[in-house]
Amino acid sequence: IVLRPSRVHNSEENTMRALTLKDILNGTFSYKTFFPNWISGQEYLHQSADNNIVLYNIETGQSYTILSNRTMKSVNASNYGLSPDRQFVYLESDYSKLWRYSYTATYYIYDLSNGEFVRGNELPRPIQYLCWSPVGSKLAYVYQNNIYLKQRPGDPPFQITFNGRENKIFNGIPDWVYEEEMLATKYALWWSPNGKFLAYAEFNDTDIPVIAYSYYGDEQYPRTINIPYPKAGAKNPVVRIFIIDTTYPAYVGPQEVPVPAMIASSDYYFSWLTWVTDERVCLQWLKRVQNVSVLSICDFREDWQTWDCPKTQEHIEESRTGWAGGFFVSTPVFSYDAISYYKIFSDKDGYKHIHYIKDTVENAIQITSGKWEAINIFRVTQDSLFYSSNEFEEYPGRRNIYRISIGSYPPSKKCVTCHLRKERCQYYTASFSDYAKYYALVCYGPGIPISTLHDGRTDQEIKILEENKELENALKNIQLPKEEIKKLEVDEITLWYKMILPPQFDRSKKYPLLIQVYGGPCSQSVRSVFAVNWISYLASKEGMVIALVDGRGTAFQGDKLLYAVYRKLGVYEVEDQITAVRKFIEMGFIDEKRIAIWGWSYGGYVSSLALASGTGLFKCGIAVAPVSSWEYYASVYTERFMGLPTKDDNLEHYKNSTVMARAEYFRNVDYLLIHGTADDNVHFQNSAQIAKALVNAQVDFQAMWYSDQNHGLSGLSTNHLYTHMTHFLKQCFSLSD
């Protein structure tokens, strides 16, 4: 199925031009999305083009500037947050990135009622995390790994924790591994719905081994970056959850929430916290061997001022075929009775679906079913449940938004988005106002992205929030590649692929093929989304065919495919890429002497293994920031899929699945190895070990390092990287410069 037809007609050909690498590096064809910052059922904030913060009321149609760009500019604010009582706005400046989600910043509080900044008892700097209470204008913030509370922005702070210490004890913020692999947030504190209580996590990293690497900077001596980072099998952080009454914080102080006995008996993780009411909280825990998860509902005991988590309110989720959940264990969405909830987990047929849990998981009522997967529950109201899935027309790489009426029996299902802009929009996300009175739909493609506002009752479109008209006009004279999404059926496995074809593609001709691979567990590369990126340029200007293939281990097609790689990383992902390449050759338009593969991170691992598979299929390939041995990667991620690197568990496959073990097989391919020296995530160590193994095997290869760059290789490094990779591929494919 052709998703993005190129608008090329003979008469137009001379006015149309191909994409250039410069277009890509300059972000010439980037798109905009519009996510309303909802502040009520019918109001949202949005930063205007001239940087005023504007409040929009959908029902009255009125809008006014709540915060002037003059105020934003006076502190060089790059972000803001309105207090729920609308009295104050925090302004964030001096943004300083730490890891994937975390950053520090300076915060200023602007008093909207008095039209001036709050002076006195100002916030310290830099702050690691800051947030308003859900009601009123209390502030919680983390400074130097300790949590502080202010009843009002101008009040003196109350210090909640005192044991915070850099790289040792983290309060209210995650350590490296929890941030990257478990919480996927920069914070680890949660206000109760009305701001009565504040829950927070304490992470103790005292016994975790430290990864140390040089940061070269500009000084005479490099500095050493030290990060407590548990690699597979190493000592993990110790986590504790506390809750404090923010009305009288000094009265009893923080109270620890007990860990379920079946979890506490061995190493475990805390995976998420969900407040149900001000006096009921839901915690999710996970065994270190990540196939058992426990959801624990705890209640506040007024008489003892403690939190009680009865065994009758413990719900166990266990996987017998893989790990618990998808990438993460799903989180519950509670219904109005404050005890029952909706949750996505595998059904008996091995597809992730929405279930309704009233008393026990065993008695769960299945809400959705079919050979497709429910992906996200957006909102549950009194009468509707909104979720996304890839059910429509059986394309796993699509996302549509559905509404299930839970107020009526039997519940009826309606696809909200399936027929809205069918050709343009097949991949949606949504953002809901309070009580789902209104919602925004953000369509990511396959056509040019568009964001729209809708009535939550009737689903009627109210207005277009962003339609990327400028982008549409800019692309009118560009020869975009054609894209198609299809599937291969091989040995009872369905391999979905996306093929990006040159604008004047002719099936009777032969084209060089580049495979772009990620392939990590629970990932998906074949998605119906719009993108004008490096591979678009390679197809448009350099005449390459690019293919992305979702093989075993990838997501949203059922547990059989997902859990196929359990305890066996680096085998089937590679096999499936190779199988797909063979199928592509059979299609007749691929020059089998000019096939390359490239990937980043997990994709760098897969591309390296594919190059070293000994098949002779690949002429060359690139690995950017690859994992080279699972013993070098983070415990939480690695052990989820591989178990432990111990003799009595899975050490043998840890050893067999390294890139280094296949060093000899790189002899007959051109290999470009690339890594940032300050990669906190996939450590430079991984590429250093590949390089050492290749040198020891006397195998020639090319390499590029990026000094002081992390896993993202951002800024000027990005330009250098893509220019360098382009030269490498053009040389490999004998394309003139």
């Epitope: 409040l55 006014y64 008093d111 909207l112 009622s113 008095n114």
Partner: antibody, heavy 124, light 113 residues
């Protein structure tokens, strides 16, 4: 010349409410917040609260919270202060005053123009 | 809340003589970021609203005679009338606008001796 003109004197019974208006002119209404200050006989000036006409957001002195409501009508460039559950000790002259909005981080302004005052007498 | 205390409560000065009023705040009104003191002085004559004389502790409001001057920083401030005139008979108030609630001193009554 900038003007803040307040409504006339009021006599109220205990438990009643009073609403005082402050009509402004000859300046840009939305460039200033409006504040209310009272002065009981022989007492110091006492700040009641203020409001930002741009967003209609009020700020009240905790002492008056629950009893005072400050509002604005931007189209009429007028601010209002309503005080409920009146008691004899609320007998005072009530003033409105303007204060320039501080957009910048280093700004901060005093109340530069005041209304003529409204005498509110609470007596049974 | 910041408490403002003025001294003396009343002051009688001969015409042409200097009058000095002190004002003390319970916490510093000096803002470290701009080194400004958030203190104002007002003059109130009988039956009239207060009139702004001085802001930022020492900056004269336009139209205010230069015999009025303000000084001090942090917690201690002074209003000086260098040469008292008959029309200066009034009650003078200091006020902090450093933080909310805004608070005033109890006032100093200036009379002619």
């Amino acid at each position: 010349q900038v003007q803040l003109v307040q409504s006339g004197a009021e006599v109220k019974k205990p438990g009643a409410s009073v609403k005082v208006s402050c009509k402004t002119s000859r300046y840009t209404f939305t460039e200033y917040t409006i504040h209310w200050v009272r002065q009981a006989p022989g007492q110091r000036l006492e700040w009641i609260g203020g409001i930002n006409p741009n967003n209609g957001i009020p700020n009240y002195n905790d002492k008056f919270k629950g009893r005072v409501t400050i509002t604005v009508d931007t189209s009429a460039s007028t601010a209002y202060m309503e005080l409920s559950s009146l008691r004899s000790e609320d007998t005072a002259v009530y003033y409105c005053a303007r204060r320039r909005i501080a957009y910048g981080y280093d700004e901060g302004h005093a109340m530069d123009y005041w209304g003529q005052g409204t005498l509110v007498t609470v007596s049974s | 809340d910041i408490v403002m205390t003025q001294s003396p409560d009343s002051l009688a000065v001969s015409l042409g003589e200097r009058a000095t009023i002190n004002c003390k705040s319970s916490q510093s009104l000096l803002y470290s970021r701009n080194q400004k003191n958030y203190l104002a002085w007002y003059q109130q004559k009988p039956g009239q609203p207060p009139k702004l004389l001085i802001f930022w502790a020492s900056t004269r409001e336009s139209g205010v005679p230069d015999r009025f001057s303000g000084s001090g920083f942090g917690t201690d401030f002074t209003l000086t009338i260098s040469s008292l005139q008959a029309e200066d008979v009034a009650v003078y108030y200091c006020q902090q606008y450093f933080s909310y609630p805004l608070t005033f001193g109890q006032g100093t009554k200036v009379e002619i001796k």
